[in-house]
């Protein structure tokens, strides 16, 4: 058993049929010595008396808010949550496996630049009695500070018969060094509590591996005289790291016909313009990627040819 | 040329060669995200490689103030990786494919280090750790780790030379 926060405790249980469970001793936080009784949740049934209460925790019916009283007055509370371990593996019932970029990916994180700011998100089908708490650091043995905000519900989607909820959190490294080569990964830890079930999820990454620039901005076409060619121009996204002479991007320009089956013409360039042939009913799209490190491409910015 | 006396390197040449190094490092090990090498017990291997750290003066202001600190650090790293790529980690079994970019990568590391430090000048270099894995699978894993680490190192070096070429070239 360990303390998650004040008056909230997590009991770690091996979860299998007829498991013996865990013996837990609760102590009433009071100078009083006698006349103390214990109850669980809203029930008025007295579970025991005395300053301590010993219970055998085996299942969710044994978890909940234990309260010690004296003469009708509440003295203190202890909330017990369960963390299940099945076949040596901690349960992951609360969050959905996003399966990208690999199986057992519950947390996904992205950064728009090298400033040390990043966003993580996760999915669940649970809509109520759900709380999250996020902590982060750079490295684990001698951790350096990363400050995370509160997790918020950022999207709701309908998937077949199910509703899916997306939560996200923004974090900022306290003393980021954008021009250095990262040697210690960022660690992100999410505590999830659904009713009386506790789970924790972790992710470890370098900022450089989760970089995904915003799409290029101000995408414009300029027809060239007496030609089917156009000059396409664009600019670095506002969110990309500065100075751009140091944090450079490379770009992919694509000409795509109306039909998805039509052949796509692609040009790669480090410049912020390119000359392409604009076919009727086609569209021109541009996306960006870090010039020197192959992290994710941005989403496409697009304009119609006409 | 970036010599200990403090004269300037051939920024544009260094820029071109470092960008080529980035391309080669990724073609030698394109698997980004598919294999989480940090789960494979990193400590004894890639922790020993030289990293370009916050105090090494490789940020734009640091390069302006005195590029020598940063260039020396980059030079150290290039020599270190050049030795690793020439070691039995890469030359032993399982053999690299004949058209593997590792050979080109090795040559380019040497080329850039010579651009930074011509014959006759000596910056101290870092000791290369004695990594000689016994099993072919260990060697393969170590190659992946070294290449992933090299990708991060050459990315920073390439940014340094790009910025230098744009703002510090005579």
């Amino acid at each position: 058993i360990w303390e998650l926060k004040k008056d909230v405790y997590v009991v770690e249980l091996d979860w299998y049929p007829d498991a013996p469970g865990e013996m837990v001793v609760l102590t009433c936080d009071t100078p009083e010595e006698d006349g103390i009784t214990w109850t669980l949740d809203q029930s008025s049934e007295v579970l025991g008396s005395g300053k301590t209460l010993t219970i055998q925790v085996k299942e969710f019916g044994d978890a909940g808010q234990y309260t010690c009283h004296k003469g009708g007055e509440v003295l203190s509370h202890s909330l017990l949550l369960l963390h299940k371990k099945e076949d040596g593996i901690w349960s992951t019932d609360i969050l959905k496996d996003q399966k990208e970029p690999k199986n057992k990916t519950f947390l996904r994180c992205e950064a728009k630049n090298y400033s040390g700011r990043f966003t993580c998100w996760w999915l669940t089908t649970i809509s109520t009695d759900l709380t999250f708490s996020v902590k982060s650091s750079r490295g684990s043995s001698d951790p350096q500070g990363v400050t995370c905000g509160a997790a918020t519900l950022s999207a709701e989607r309908v998937r077949g018969d199910n509703k899916e909820y997306e939560y996200s959190v923004e974090c900022q490294e306290d003393s980021a060094c954008p021009a250095a080569e990262e040697s210690l990964p960022i660690e992100v830890m999410v505590d999830a509590v659904h009713k009386l079930k506790y789970e924790n999820y972790t992710s470890s990454f370098f900022i450089r591996d989760i970089i995904k620039p915003d799409p290029p901005k101000n995408l414009q076409l300029k027809p060239l005289k007496n030609s089917r060619q156009v000059e396409v121009s664009w600019e670095y996204p506002d969110t990309w790291s500065t100075p751009h002479s140091y944090f450079s991007l490379t770009f992919c320009v694509q000409v795509q016909g109306k039909s998805k089956r039509e052949k796509k013409d692609r040009v790669f360039t480090d410049k912020t313009s390119a000359t392409v042939i604009c076919r009727k009913n086609a569209s021109i799209s541009v996306r960006a990627q870090d010039r020197y490190y192959s992290s994710s491409w941005s989403e496409w910015a697009s304009v119609p040819c006409s | 040329r970036a010599v200990p006396g403090g004269s300037s390197p051939a920024w544009t040449q260094c820029q071109q060669l470092s960008q080529k190094l980035c391309t080669l490092a990724w073609s030698a090990h394109p698997l980004v995200g598919h294999m989480d090498l940090r789960e494979e017990g990193d400590e004894e291997t890639t922790n020993d490689v030289p990293h370009i750290q916050c105090g090494d003066g490789c940020d734009p202001q640091g390069l302006r103030d005195n590029s020598q600190f940063c260039l020396q650090r980059i030079h150290q790293g290039l020599i270190f990786y050049e030795k690793l790529l020439g070691s039995d980690i890469f030359t032993g079994e399982p053999s690299l494919l004949p058209d593997s970019p590792v050979g080109q990568l090795h040559a380019s590391l040497l080329g850039l280090s010579q651009l930074l430090q011509p014959e006759g000048h000596h910056w101290e270099t870092q000791q290369i750790p004695s990594l000689s894995p016994s099993q072919p699978w260990q060697r393969l894993l170590l190659r992946f780790k070294i290449l992933r680490s090299l990708q991060a190192f050459v990315a920073v070096a390439a940014r340094v030379f790009a910025h230098g070429a744009a703002t510090l070239s005579p």
Epitope: A179, T242, P243 | A166
Partner: nanobody, 125 residues
């Protein structure tokens, strides 16, 4: 020593123009982006515009797009904010600030490492 000094503020009628200057010393504009912020009485400080002098990239907040133009003169190590079609709601103290390495042109105020003392712009008839 890094310093940013704004000038060019003053009283102007609605529809009028002003050109603010931000003279930088102690560093080169090539190495950092510069941002303009403003703070109206009783309001939060807000980002107005930003420039990366190395490649000329610029950013404008929606509220000033098409009316304000940011530019720089690297030889003079100075950034300018040309403000046209001024409105009463543009009244504020305007500050220039140096953007920390690695942040974007639209970075929040906590991403700045040096600030000027500000210049007051009043738009009133």
């Amino acid at each position: 020593e890094v310093q940013l000094v704004e000038s060019g503020g003053g009283l102007v009628q609605p529809g009028g123009s002003l050109r603010l200057s931000c003279a930088a010393s102690g560093f080169y504009l090539d190495d950092y982006a510069i941002a303009w912020f403003r703070q109206a009485p009783g309001k939060e400080r807000e980002g107005v515009s930003g420039i990366d002098s190395g490649d000329g990239s610029t950013y404008y907040a929606d509220s000033v797009k098409g009316r304000f133009t940011i530019s720089s003169d690297n030889a003079k190590n100075t950034v300018y904010l040309q403000m046209n079609s001024l409105r009463p709601e543009d009244t504020a103290v305007y500050y220039c600030a140096r953007v920390r390495t690695g942040w974007g042109l639209n970075a929040p105020d906590y991403a700045m490492d040096y600030w000027g003392k500000g210049t007051l712009v009043t738009v009133s008839s």
